[in-house]
C-alpha cells in the first residue's frame, strides 16, 4: 500500500485551497503517521500528520477514507504495547526516569493533537493571555479535564457563542485604575 | 477599592470540620475568580485551588483535590474553603486571592489578609 | 507539578541589581509565558510584583523586572533598597490538570 491517502469526499485544504470534489482527478495526499483514533456518532476516524505539511495541517478524517493500513496498524500497536507497559509492575523503575522514557513521553506531548484539532467541542473559556504577543484562549472541552490555549481569532471563528459568553461574564463596565497594567 | 476580607483565626481539634470564608467589595465579585493559597509555618506559598464565583465552577491542585472544598455564594459575594476532617498537617496561614484582570489564568493581584488555622488535640 | 526552583537566599548592597531564578520544566515555565512573581514581608501577605513574565502592575516600582529564557525565569531588582528586602516567590501556569505551581521561595538580605 502506498500511504496514500484520496482525499474527494471531505474536501481537505491544502494551503487554503479547499479542494473541489468535482474534480476529475481528486489531489492525493500522502499521510506520514497515524497520530489519534477517535469514534464520532459510531464512525471510527484517525488523526493524520501529513507528508510536506506542519503540524498545523493535521486532521482527522473518517477510516473508510484512508488507504495506509500499515500507518494504522502501527498506530494501533504502538497504543497496545503502550497500554501493556502501563499495565506492567514498577518494582524495577528507579525513582528517576530513564531518559528514554523521558523523550519519549516528550515525543508523545508534541504528538498529542492540540487545542482544536482535538476534535472534541469546546465547553468555556477558563482565561485569556496575550503574554505571546497573540491573544489566546484558555479552553476547556467537554467530556476533558484537560485545556488548551488556543488562538482567540480560531475561537472567534469556531465557538463564537462561548466567547461571546466568557466576554460577558468578565465584562466589567467600571474601569479601575490599580487594575490596569503600566 | 478593591477588598477580600478573611474569617477570623480558628484553632480547631484534629477530625473536625472546618468552614473559612473571604468576602469580596468594591468590585464585580463574580467577574473573577477567587484562588486559596496555603502557607505553612515558617514555608513557602502554595497554590491550592480557584473557584469562579459566576457559577462555581473550580479547578483543584492535585495535592488539594478531594481534602478541601472550595464553593462561593455569589449572592452575598463570599467564597469558602472548608475541610469535612482536620489534620494537624493542615495548620497554616490560607489566603484568598483575586487576580488582577477578569481574565487572568494563574496570576492574582489582590489578596485577603489571612486566615490562621491552628489543628491541635 | 513539583514546585519550581528558586535559589534559598540572595543578598546585595544597596543601589546594587540582584537577580532572582525560577527554573521549572518544558510543562510549566518552558511552555507558557505565564510567569508571576510575589513579594512577601514577615506576617503579611503576598504583594503581586511581575505577572505574564515582564508585565508590572501599577504601583510597582520600575525597578522590578520580569523576564524568561527556555525553563527559567527570572526576577530582577536594580537599585537595590533596604525595604526590597523580603521573601520572593515565583509561579507559573503549570497545565489544566496542576494549573499553577509556585517556587519555594528566595530571601533577599539587602546588607548593609
Known amino acids: 500500500a502506498s500511504n496514500k491517502t484520496t482525499l474527494q469526499k471531505m474536501g481537505k485544504k491544502q494551503n487554503g485551497k479547499s479542494k473541489k470534489v468535482e474534480e476529475a482527478e481528486p489531489e492525493e495526499f500522502v499521510v506520514e503517521k497515524v497520530l489519534d483514533r477517535r469514534v464520532v456518532n459510531g464512525k471510527v476516524e484517525y488523526f493524520l500528520k501529513w507528508k510536506g505539511f506542519t503540524d498545523a495541517d493535521n486532521t482527522w478524517e473518517p477510516e473508510e477514507n484512508l488507504d495506509c493500513p500499515e500507518l494504522i496498524e502501527a498506530f494501533l500497536n504502538s497504543q497496545k504495547a503502550g497500554k501493556e507497559k502501563d499495565g506492567t509492575k514498577r518494582k524495577s523503575l528507579s525513582d528517576s526516569e530513564s531518559d528514554d522514557s523521558k523523550s519519549k513521553k516528550k515525543r508523545d506531548a508534541a504528538d498529542k493533537p492540540r487545542g482544536f484539532a482535538r476534535g472534541l467541542d469546546p465547553e468555556r473559556i477558563i482565561g485569556a493571555t496575550d503574554s505571546s504577543g497573540e491573544l489566546m484562549f484558555l479552553m476547556k472541552w467537554k467530556d476533558s479535564d484537560e485545556a488548551d490555549l488556543v488562538l482567540a481569532k480560531e475561537a472567534n471563528m469556531k465557538c463564537p457563542q462561548i466567547v461571546i459568553a466568557f466576554y460577558e461574564e468578565r465584562l466589567t463596565w467600571h474601569s479601575c485604575p490599580e487594575d490596569e497594567a503600566q | 477599592a478593591v477588598q477580600l476580607v478573611q474569617s477570623g483565626a480558628e484553632v480547631k481539634k484534629p477530625g473536625e470540620s472546618l468552614r473559612i470564608s473571604c468576602k469580596g467589595s468594591g468590585y464585580s465579585f463574580t467577574s473573577y475568580w477567587i484562588s486559596w493559597v496555603r502557607q505553612m509555618p515558617g514555608k513557602g506559598l502554595e497554590w491550592m485551588g480557584r473557584i469562579d464565583p459566576s457559577d462555581s465552577y473550580t479547578n483543584y491542585s492535585p495535592s488539594f483535590q478531594g481534602h478541601v472544598t472550595i464553593s462561593a455564594d455569589k449572592s452575598i459575594s463570599t467564597a469558602y474553603l472548608q475541610w469535612s476532617s482536620l489534620k494537624t498537617s493542615d495548620t497554616a496561614m490560607y489566603y484568598c486571592?483575586?487576580?488582577?484582570?477578569?481574565?487572568?489564568?494563574?496570576?492574582?493581584?489582590?489578596w485577603g489578609q489571612g486566615t490562621l488555622v491552628t489543628v491541635s488535640s | 507539578a513539583s514546585a519550581l526552583t528558586q535559589p534559598a537566599s540572595v543578598s546585595g548592597s544597596p543601589g546594587q541589581s540582584i537577580t532572582i531564578s525560577c527554573t521549572g520544566t518544558?510543562?510549566?515555565?518552558?511552555?507558557?509565558?505565564?510567569v508571576s512573581w510575589y513579594q512577601q514581608h514577615p506576617g503579611k501577605a503576598p504583594k503581586l510584583m511581575i505577572y505574564?513574565?515582564?508585565k508590572r502592575p501599577s504601583g510597582v516600582s520600575n525597578r522590578f523586572s520580569g523576564s524568561k529564557s527556555g525553563n527559567t525565569a527570572s526576577l530582577t531588582i536594580s537599585g537595590l533598597q533596604a525595604e526590597d528586602e523580603a521573601d520572593y516567590y515565583c509561579?507559573?501556569?503549570?497545565?489544566?490538570?496542576?494549573?499553577?505551581?509556585f517556587g519555594g521561595g528566595t530571601k533577599l538580605t539587602v546588607l548593609g
Open positions: 509561579c507559573s501556569y503549570a497545565g489544566s490538570s496542576t494549573f499553577a505551581v
Open positions: 486571592a483575586r487576580p488582577l484582570q477578569t481574565y487572568s489564568i494563574a496570576s492574582v493581584g489582590h
Open positions: 505574564e513574565g515582564s
Open positions: 518544558s510543562s510549566d515555565v518552558g511552555s507558557y509565558n505565564l
